[in-house]
Amino acid sequence: CKAMHVAQPAVVLASSRGIASFVCEYASPGKATEVRVTVLRQADSQVTEVCAATYMMGNELTFLDDSICTGTSSGNQVNLTIQGLRAMDTGLYICKVELMYPPPYYLGIGNGTQIYVIDPEPCPDSDF
């Protein structure tokens, strides 16, 4: 089958600080030296890009400074962390992997990770 398989967990619960982490693993059909990883959010039929990073195999994964994502890579596995999440950000987050170089190009799309975010209860005022 001329395709790239991408695996990611089905469900992740964000921490009380609005941080969610998950592993995105891909089975590379070729020996890529340049890989692009994108996190997409799917709401209804709309798909939007959350963050993206390109890395050279063996080097570290670097997102833009203003990105809400951070990550590390090890072989064909990427550990992704999304920060600053609120309850309204609950949804399906898809890991997309592209083998950019050398040819041929391959596209891999995971089934998505449902991230649940619960806003923390505000601390009650204390009376002394």
Epitope: C1, K2, V47, Y101, L107
Partner: antibody, heavy 118, light 108 residues
Framework: QVQLVESGGGVVQPGRSLRLSCAAS????????MHWVRQAPGKGLEWVAV????????YYADSVKGRFTISRDNSKNTLDLQMNSLRAEDTAVYYC???????????WGQGTLVTVSS | EIVLTQSPGTLSLSPGERATLSCRAS???????LAWYQQKPGQAPRLLIY???SRATGIPDRFSGSGSGTDFTLTISRLEPEDFAVYYC?????????FGQGTKVEIK
């Protein structure tokens, strides 16, 4: 709204060159791969070339490799196709198309006709 | 290169009838990377279905896609006058991007 508008088509003699452009608007251009697809008169669709994101990675169909060059200017939201050593079989309507996040081509321009004839 | 073969070449049907279009791949492909497009004369192609079965934005639910492996199908449940056009399948999971040769749905 997303808009793609091609220009630069026309009649050209075999062996000559032509440059097509595609002006994009209504979306963050640098976040998308962009393709050229062509359609010879009365025929089906043929993928020609793609350029990714920052413009470093490009792929071409075997039929145009070494003759066509795809490029983009993210500051101007434009996509170009430089076509050299044109042949009669390059006669077609050329479309630019946006690569949607999940991989298919979700928006297309109206097309520009290139006729290679002596 | 993945070769896509569409059948039939031409489908002659009446409005209100059901249309079933086939797309066969030369080797197994993931359903995540199979799309269908509609093209009317003098117009650009329009994305109908991606991921073999997901309808693109604004596409009516009379259009549906299915299939896996090497065999994929586009079904139009009840043909409307505006559905008479040429339909193309496409594989986009790896380079080169390929299209089928098209199926023309014409009025009987």
């Amino acid at each position: 709204q997303v808009q793609l508008v091609e220009s630069g088509g026309g009649v050209v003699q075999p062996g000559r060159s032509l440059r097509l452009s595609c002006a994009a608007s209504g979306f963050t251009f640098s976040s998308y791969g962009m393709h050229w697809v062509r359609q010879a008169p009365g025929k089906g669709l043929e993928w020609v070339a793609v350029i990714w994101y920052d413009g470093r990675n490009k792929y071409y169909a075997d039929s145009v490799k070494g003759r066509f060059t795809i490029s983009r200017d993210n500051s101007k939201n434009t996509l170009d196709l430089q076509m050299n050593s044109l042949r009669a079989e390059d006669t077609a309507v050329y479309y630019c198309a946006r690569n949607q996040p999940l991989g298919s081509f979700d928006y297309w321009g109206q097309g520009t006709l290139v006729t290679v004839s002596s | 290169e993945i070769v896509l073969t569409q059948s039939p070449g031409t489908l002659s049907l009446s409005p209100g009838e059901r249309a079933t279009l086939s797309c066969r791949a030369s080797q197994s492909v993931s359903s995540s990377y199979l799309a269908w497009y509609q093209q009317k004369p003098g117009q650009a192609p329009r994305l109908l279905i991606y991921g073999a079965s997901s309808r693109a934005t604004g596409i009516p639910d009379r259009f549906s896609g299915s299939g896996s492996g090497t065999d994929f199908t586009l079904t139009i449940s009840r043909l409307e006058p505006e559905d008479f056009a040429v339909y193309y399948c496409q594989h986009y999971g790896s380079s080169p991007w390929t299209f089928g040769q098209g199926t023309k749905v014409e009025i009987k």
